[in-house]
Amino acid sequence: NQDLPVIKCVLINHKNNDSSVGKSSSYPMVSESPEDLGCALRPQSSGTVYEAAAVEVDVSASITLQVLVDAPGNISCLWVFKHSSLNCQPHFDLQNRGVVSMVILKMTETQAGEYLLFIQSEATNYTILFTVSIRNTLLYTLRRPYFRKMENQDALVCISESVPEPIVEWVLCDSQGESCKEESPAVVKKEEKVLHELFGTDIRCCARNELGRECTRLFTIDLNQTPQTTLPQLFLKVGEPLWIRCKAVHVNHGFGLTWELENKALEEGNYFEMSTYSTNRTMIRILFAFVSSVARNDTGYYTCSSSKHPSQSALVTIVEKGFINATNSSEDYEIDQYEEFCFSVRFKAYPQIRCTWTFSRKSFPCEQKGLDNGYSISKFCNHKHQPGEYIFHAENDDAQFTKMFTLNIRRKPQVLAEASASQASCFSDGYPLPSWTWKKCSDKSPNCTEEITEGVWNRKANRKVFGQWVSSSTLNMSEAIKGFLVKCCAYNSLGTSCETILLNSPGPFPFIQDNIS
């Protein structure tokens, strides 16, 4: 009203020709014409808070956020961005208005967020809030959906800022656990952005376009369910919206729900309640806790209490950057030829990972399952008992993770032989890696029992075929054995396999293959 200073908030877009870092400034660069941001007094704020219309900026663009103050006398000011204070140098224009500017050069993701300007004048103190986000200009993107309260209605809107425009659907389930799997008959899908029926057991929103499908689950605490052994944990990045639903059912309406963060009631405007009668005339109440854009200080234990149920809590952790926590040490496994076995990786990650399993340069789809303790697990069982090296690779917007596995299949050796003018070689891929013996077949030893020890050269792991180790043994030809049949035998704990070779001319001459168990 007329007692308050007249505030004008403007955005100035600059032609990009500067490469220095963003700074608070009193003299902005040469630019395009200023855009009015309709500064409005924020309703029901403690203190005088003006908010500028939301600002969207292209990546690498340079802008100035500017405030013009029509108030008598001097002003002092302070900019605050992500809890850091930035200097502020007001000056006065030709109409004697106070001018305060914040220049952001070469806009990046880290410079997006809320900019607060605190102004102190001779008459009053007030705050101006600018919210700056990056315009999505990527060709094709698929972003994880997030929730927003429908403008002044008891309904949630599901939004996925993706290109091309994704198809958004709500995936609802009213039963517990395994029966809420995607293909289950208990699952109902609604291809719409707005959801009014918010009382269900499990609520997810999914967005899909040419790049695939991404889903976000509405984090829920159910006071009628036995609490998990470990406290449920919810991770969010700074600037993301927080939504937690607390649900309780009681025989009648005589109960209430409340949210607390670290034993302090949530501020009004950060929660809303809905209630309905179920088919058996019991009362269902849900209480949403929400923060439209979280900051570090929104971290903590959120507790939902009821006058008729034991309270339950969830730990909300706000991080600056996404992460993937898992042990990356390589793991070796040996299994029998028909043994059932799956590789598995247990990890904690935020945002949700995209992952692949790779074997022999071929990638396989990767499934993840959430565990009760906040960890997730990915299993790979489709190895078809092929020995070798398997790679698990995971990534999200901020982190990457790779883990190697070696699979060895216990089996009797199988021998392949080849001979040249100067030597004979035998190869085997059995596991455990076999040991070798060479024997000479002669009139004196028709059963080939005369052992050859001279000129033998064994090499374990001669070549690695996609992680599959091959053992070889080479016999150098000498006059003593030229023209004779020789037998190479590979043996391990599961058996022996032999190959007989005639040592008279080059070329492979597998003569007889013996399989001695």
Epitope: P43, T131, Q153
Partner: antibody
Framework: QVTLKESGPTLVKPTETLTLTCTVS??????????VSWIRQPPGKCLEWLAH???????SYSTSLKSRLTISKDTSKSQVVLTMTNMDPVDTATYYC???????????????????WGQGTTVTVSS | DIQMTQSPSSLSASVGDRVTITCRAS??????LAWYQQKPGKAPKRLIY???TVQSGVPSRFSGSGSGTEFALTISSLQPEDFATYYC?????????FGCGTKVDIK
């Protein structure tokens, strides 16, 4: 300074299509959730909200006139266009465009109605 | 759609009078209501938004109150320049809707 200026024919015949243009300055139609509404007022009668369009191309129309209205924008020209088909003498009115700033962040937008209006353009429907 | 009912449709008052205009919504709209003033031949001008927040530059004799379905605009001491028609607008859910106006004229 924010200004909105309506332009279009002052006279249209019944059954014809009316095309009105709102040219804006002092703010950008491409900025986050900045919107423009069309409102009309028949002579001596109430204000009637017709339609809006936001920077992300989100649109909404008056329920009773939905089938006849189309709203679009050309950000590069800073223009919002409203077309109304099958005009009738009862559509004689002053047509206004007005700005709707969207407040909030990446994830949560809210509105406080129209803050700045154009001066209006009078349209008469008569044969 | 949400219907907005304004009353009275017109009133006569003198300079210095305290004037109250009411607006009723057909369903709860929280505090998502704006008040506009319109003078003959001119475009409407926003006085109040969010039911009770006075637009910057608007005289402090104008005030708004209410929440849910019942709202009021009060002019504490009517001035000559306040003779005009006043409209309420719900900006709670689309389609937005106006009340049909209250004309304040000189007694």
């Amino acid at each position: 300074q924010v200004t909105l200026k309506e332009s279009g024919p002052t006279l249209v015949k019944p059954t014809e299509t009316l095309t009105l243009t709102c040219t804006v300055s002092g703010f950008s139609l491409s900025n986050a959730r900045m919107g423009v509404s069309w409102i009309r007022q028949p002579p001596g009668k109430c204000l009637e909200w017709l339609a809006h369009i936001f920077s992300n191309d989100e649109k909404s129309y008056s329920t009773s006139l939905k089938s006849r209205l189309t709203i679009s924008k050309d950000t590069s020209k800073s223009q919002v266009v409203l077309t109304m088909t099958n005009m009738d003498p009862v559509d004689t009115a002053t047509y206004y465009c007005a700005r709707i700033p969207g407040y909030g962040g990446n994830f949560y937008y809210h509105y406080y109605g129209m803050d700045v209006w154009g001066q209006g353009t009078t349209v008469t429907v008569s044969s | 759609d949400i219907q907005m009912t304004q009353s009275p449709s017109s009133l006569s008052a003198s300079v210095g009078d305290r004037v109250t205009i009411t607006c009723r919504a057909s369903q709860g709209i929280r505090n998502d209501l704006a008040w506009y003033q319109q003078k003959p031949g001119k475009a409407p001008k926003r006085l109040i938004y969010a039911a009770s927040t006075v637009q910057s530059g608007v005289p402090s004799r104008f005030s708004g109150s209410g929440s849910g379905t019942e709202f009021a605009l009060t002019i504490s001491s009517l001035q000559p320049e306040d003779f005009a028609t006043y409209y309420c607008l719900q900006h709670n859910s689309f389609p937005w809707t106006f009340g049909c106006g209250t004309k304040v004229d000189i007694k």
